[in-house]
């Protein structure tokens, strides 16, 4: 799709090309399975162009179909512990607020490995907050080439 000369003058945000790439900040306190994210040029190769962070969770500011992607590597991990824990270690990405739109978008399990990665296309609406829940007791790496989370606006 070619852009008109007028469109070429506009900032990407006004064209709807919202995009974010985040790195892990920290895990939650007891009973909180969420991962908390951070982004910005001062932190390295992470950024937010349109979406915003709300207490470490990613909030969408523009309706559209988005590519959501995530990779998580465990820093405390073993091939046995990922399969023998009473509660298997799983990663779920979902809309956690508003409550009326709450839904799981991605669910992955650490079966025999220490890294999981996935992506999918999904419609998101302004105000949707995405939460990433890591259940089980293993600890994710904060290395920026091992653990990252992002969204990319694809079309209205």
């Amino acid at each position: 799709q070619r852009l008109s000369r007028a469109q070429q003058q506009l900032p990407l945000e006004s064209l709807g090309w919202d995009i974010a790439e985040l790195q892990l900040n920290h895990t939650g306190p007891q009973q909180d399975p969420r991962l908390y994210w951070q982004g910005g040029p001062a932190l390295g190769r992470s950024f937010l162009r349109g979406p915003e962070l709300d207490k470490g969770q990613l909030r969408i500011r523009r309706d559209g179909i988005y590519m959501v992607h995530i990779q998580v590597t465990l820093a405390i991990c073993s091939s046995t512990s990922t399969s023998r824990h009473h509660h298997p270690t799983t990663l779920a990405v979902g809309i956690c607020s508003p409550a009326s739109r709450s839904i799981s978008l991605l669910r992955l399990s650490f079966h025999q490995g220490c890294t999981i990665a996935s992506q999918r296309l999904t419609p998101l609406a302004r105000g949707d907050t995405l939460c990433t829940n890591l259940t089980g007791t293993l600890l994710p790496s904060r290395n920026t080439d091992e653990t990252f989370f992002g969204v990319q606006w694809v079309r209205p």
């Epitope: 939650g28 909180d32 820093a75 073993s78 290395n143």
Partner: antibody
Framework: EVQLLESGGGMVQPGGSLRLSCAAS????????MSWVRQAPGKCLEWVSA????????FYAESVEGRFTISRDNSKNTLYLQMNSLRAEDTAVYYC?????????????WGQGTLVTVSS | EIVLTQSPGTLSLSPGERATLSCRAS???????LAWYQQKPGQAPRLLIY???SRATGIPDRFSGSGSGTDFTLTISRLEPEDFAVYHC?????????FGCGTKVEIK
């Protein structure tokens, strides 16, 4: 300057309990995972337990699981190890250690250690 | 768990000589996540190398790490008097993290 100062070691009878503390300074304590590592006299180093920066995730060596409890108080910049049902083989110098920012359990700073002796 | 075997147990060398210490793992170490520590009598260990070959902050460049998979090496290019100590390797790619039992570098 990062400093880790252990306390609480001493002599205890088999079956007894002890609580170790580690006062941390010189870094943002709540941002880092921490571990306890021990070294029995003349023996190898052994990782004992780890805890995430927020305190929500804890990990134990098989040799201490169910007997030891790691915890932290981020408001006091202090790490703890509650040791119950102590055995002679728990006799060691216990080191408080700080993980690298990545969360991986390698240890860029160590305390001076506190000696725990389990003997009747 | 991964067992680390260090050799030799003791290395007798003179200041200025090159020291080569070996650490062998019972199975492959994930992403070469292996660290080396120096420990002097009555002191806590000090981190020298992480990620098999990256020097920790403040560590002189006479210390270097190499290797991958199951075989790792710590090299001290020219021994200084303060380098005589025990050296431990540690893998942290798999839980539990495990240590070798150390190589003692002593003055010949």
């Amino acid at each position: 300057e990062v400093q880790l100062l252990e306390s609480g070691g001493g002599m205890v009878q088999p079956g007894g309990s002890l609580r170790l503390s580690c006062a941390a300074s010189g870094f943002t304590f709540s941002s880092y995972a921490m571990s306890w590592v021990r070294q029995a006299p003349g023996k190898c180093l052994e990782w004992v337990s780890a805890i995430s920066g927020s305190g929500g995730r804890t990990f134990y060596a098989e040799s201490v699981e169910g007997r030891f409890t790691i915890s932290r108080d981020n408001s006091k910049n202090t790490l703890y190890l509650q040791m119950n049902s102590l055995r002679a083989e728990d006799t060691a110098v216990y080191y408080c250690t700080k993980h690298d920012y990545s969360n991986y359990p390698y240890f860029d700073y160590w305390g001076q250690g506190t000696l725990v002796t389990v003997s009747s | 768990e991964i067992v680390l075997t260090q050799s030799p147990g003791t290395l007798s060398l003179s200041p200025g000589e090159r020291a080569t210490l070996s650490c062998r793992a019972s199975q492959g170490v994930r992403s070469d996540y292996l660290a080396w520590y120096q420990q002097k009598p009555g002191q806590a260990p000090r981190l020298l190398i992480y990620g098999a070959s990256s020097r920790a902050t403040g560590i002189p460049d006479r210390f270097s790490g190499s290797g991958s998979g199951t075989d790792f090496t710590l090299t001290i290019s020219r021994l200084e008097p303060e380098d005589f100590a025990v050296y431990h390797c540690q893998q942290y790619g798999s839980t539990p993290p495990t240590f070798g039992c150390g190589t003692k570098v002593e003055i010949k």
